[in-house]
Interface confidence: low
Amino acid sequence: AGVFELQIHSFGPGPGPGAPRSPCSARLPCRLFFRVCLKPGLSEEAAESPCALGAALSARGPVYTEQPGAPAPDLPLPDGLLQVPFRDAWPGTFSFIIETWREELGDQIGGPAWSLLARVAGRRRLAAGGPWARDIQRAGAWELRFSYRARCEPPAVGTACTRLCRPRSAPSRCGPGLRPCAPLEDECEAPLVCRAGCSPEHGFCEQPGECRCLEGWTGPLCTVPVSTSSCLSPRGPSSATTGCLVPGPGPCDGNPCANGGSCSETPRSFECTCPRGFYGLRCEVSGVTCADGPCFNGGLCVGGADPDSAYICHCPPGFQGSNCEKRVDRCSLQPCRNGGLCLDLGHALRCRCRAGFAGPRCEHDLDDCAGRACANGGTCVEGGGAHRCSCALGFGGRDCRERADPCAARPCAHGGRCYAHFSGLVCACAPGYMGARCEFPVHPDGASALPAAPPGLRPGDPQRYL
């Protein structure tokens, strides 16, 4: 057992354009109150399905009168926490709906009028006993900021409030096999007392007095092995004599969900997922209209003026689903470019950029050559987040620091011999050829194919390539 606690920090206009008008005025003063509805699990269930984990209503906030012409500020809030007690184990995963209601305090006939200002919904994982978790949710132009936590009521402890704690009998240590109860180090974990006779090998309990069976075992005390080989009937009574576990009628047998609702089994009962226009435990209630405010998260409701016509929710950016109840995973749109890691912080998207890239969406390719020197006269060439050096003749390697063998590529043509030289290479040409790489044949009459041989160079002399 324990308590889910919700603290509303602020309710007011969200950031960006289109600030909402204040819900109150000098002519019509009003005050706010909040309702929270909790459901176990992370199911995409209809907003109208029961608040199986519990619900709570806040006190009324201070009376507020808008100043004429002023933008809507954060509205004054009720004092205190919203507390939702839970009797059983805390499920760890839960869905919530938080509604902001306005109570108009004008001279209405028949007392104050209530209207729903905003509704936010979400699904979260939360361990009992942990610190306050903070959240920001938007509903249209409104923004709600709140904190929540689940805490166990003594003597329950643990992340699901299923372990029990007792004050320790001795100041130094707990009994055999029992641990101190963090964070209550002065207390000891109490042994759970299961149902009398519950098999210590095949049974266990999460609540005192129960006996739950490990897989493969059945019976009230978990002493009967399960054998499915001799099971013939798909449904029927279980047979303790044969050791055959034959499940009895299922909660969804005969589909208890009306009006086309689909049934799913839950640990304790069943749940109906209702089509649009119907709600209730068995989808038996019809006539959801836009007047009921079925669209979450600031969705715009269209149609459904009478109970026979369906409504459609037009969802704001970031939400989807027939009731705008599902938050879009904004990172699934892959907004971060060039392999950046996307992080949805709730208040903003952030991109963690790979080396070589920058910008809010990693869209800028950094100057890869900045601060990178290529040695020995090489020039830096950018490309794809890395840099490359185009080296001067006679040098190689990533940064042009390695001296290359200029003769490795056999640069001297027509059988010329190559000699490495401090400033490059020298070709000693075979008879009948000349030129820096011995590429030009010498004509038989002694005239070169070149317009003129450089002065002082005879054909066949070594040619230095500069």
């Epitope: 610190p131 900021r145 709140f146 809010p360």
Partner: antibody, heavy 124, light 111 residues
Framework: QVQLQQSGPGLVKPSQTLSLACAIS??????????WNWIRQSPSRGLEWLGG?????????DYAVSVKSRITINPDTSKNQLSLQLNSVTPEDTAVYYC??????????????WGQGTMVTVSS | QSVLTQPPSASGTPGQRVTISCSGS????????ANWYQQLPGTAPRLLIY???QRPSGVPDRFSGSKSGTSASLAISGLQSEDEADYYC???????????FGTGTKVTVLT
């Protein structure tokens, strides 16, 4: 209540590495709602946010563009502390350095808890 | 250096109302919430206002904040001698992908 206790040398030589630590009590460095930051203040530059680290099922860092190439902010979960390393310092890095916590009032960038500050002088 | 601009000084006599402005751009105050810090001489800054107009517990209600467009302002009504301090505005900047502070305003209480 939450407290941040800073430690580290007050004098660093140019081109060396500035290293500071921030011990956290009353909160956890791996809290999934807090953001742990380093901020500095000097007469010439005023208040300057240097960067932050935070845990959201894995660790993330945000660094200011002005120091991005020189800064490292590391959480130490075993000691429940935060460290700052600033490489290749120059006299321009002379300032009072603060660690701070953000995120708790529901605004990631509102810093509600501050360390006492450490005056660091960069001089040979 | 700072991308948020504040007047260097403001003053008033005890009991007076003093307002400090903070001018930014669409990438900071225009698209994010503004925060305000108070720094008393020789101490670390203290969060005074967050999310434009919210006061943390312990901050007197004579301090109030507001935001309009790309500017924010801090008002101190009923000025007291202990309010003599430096005041800084701040906001997240989407284009710099970082948190930016204002240039700071020194508030003097005249006696």
């Amino acid at each position: 209540q939450v407290q941040l206790q800073q430690s580290g040398p007050g004098l660093v030589k140019p081109s060396q590495t500035l290293s500071l630590a921030c011990a956290i009590s009353g909160d956890s460095v791996s809290s999934n709602s807090a953001i742990w930051n380093w901020i500095r203040q000097s007469p010439s530059r005023g208040l300057e946010w240097l960067g932050g680290t935070y845990y959201r099922s894995m660790w993330y860092n945000d660094y200011a563009v002005s120091v991005k190439s020189r800064i490292t902010i590391n959480p130490d979960t075993s000691k429940n502390q935060l460290s700052l390393q600033l490489n290749s310092v120059t006299p321009e890095d002379t300032a009072v350095y603060y660690c701070s916590r953000g995120g708790i009032v529901g605004v990631p960038d509102a810093f509600d808890i501050w360390g006492q500050g450490t005056m660091v002088t960069v001089s040979s | 250096q700072s991308v948020l601009t504040q007047p260097p000084s403001a003053s008033g006599t005890p009991g007076q109302r003093v307002t400090i402005s903070c001018s930014g751009s669409s990438s900071n105050i225009g698209s994010n919430t503004a925060n305000w810090y108070q720094q008393l001489p020789g101490t670390a800054p203290r969060l005074l206002i967050y999310r434009n107009n919210q006061r943390p517990s312990g901050v007197p209600d004579r301090f109030s904040g507001s935001k309009s467009g790309t500017s924010a302002s801090l008002a101190i009504s009923g000025l007291q001698s202990e309010d003599e301090a430096d005041y800084y505005c701040a906001a997240w900047d989407d284009s710099l992908n970082g948190y930016v502070f204002g240039t700071g305003t020194k508030v003097t209480v005249l006696t």
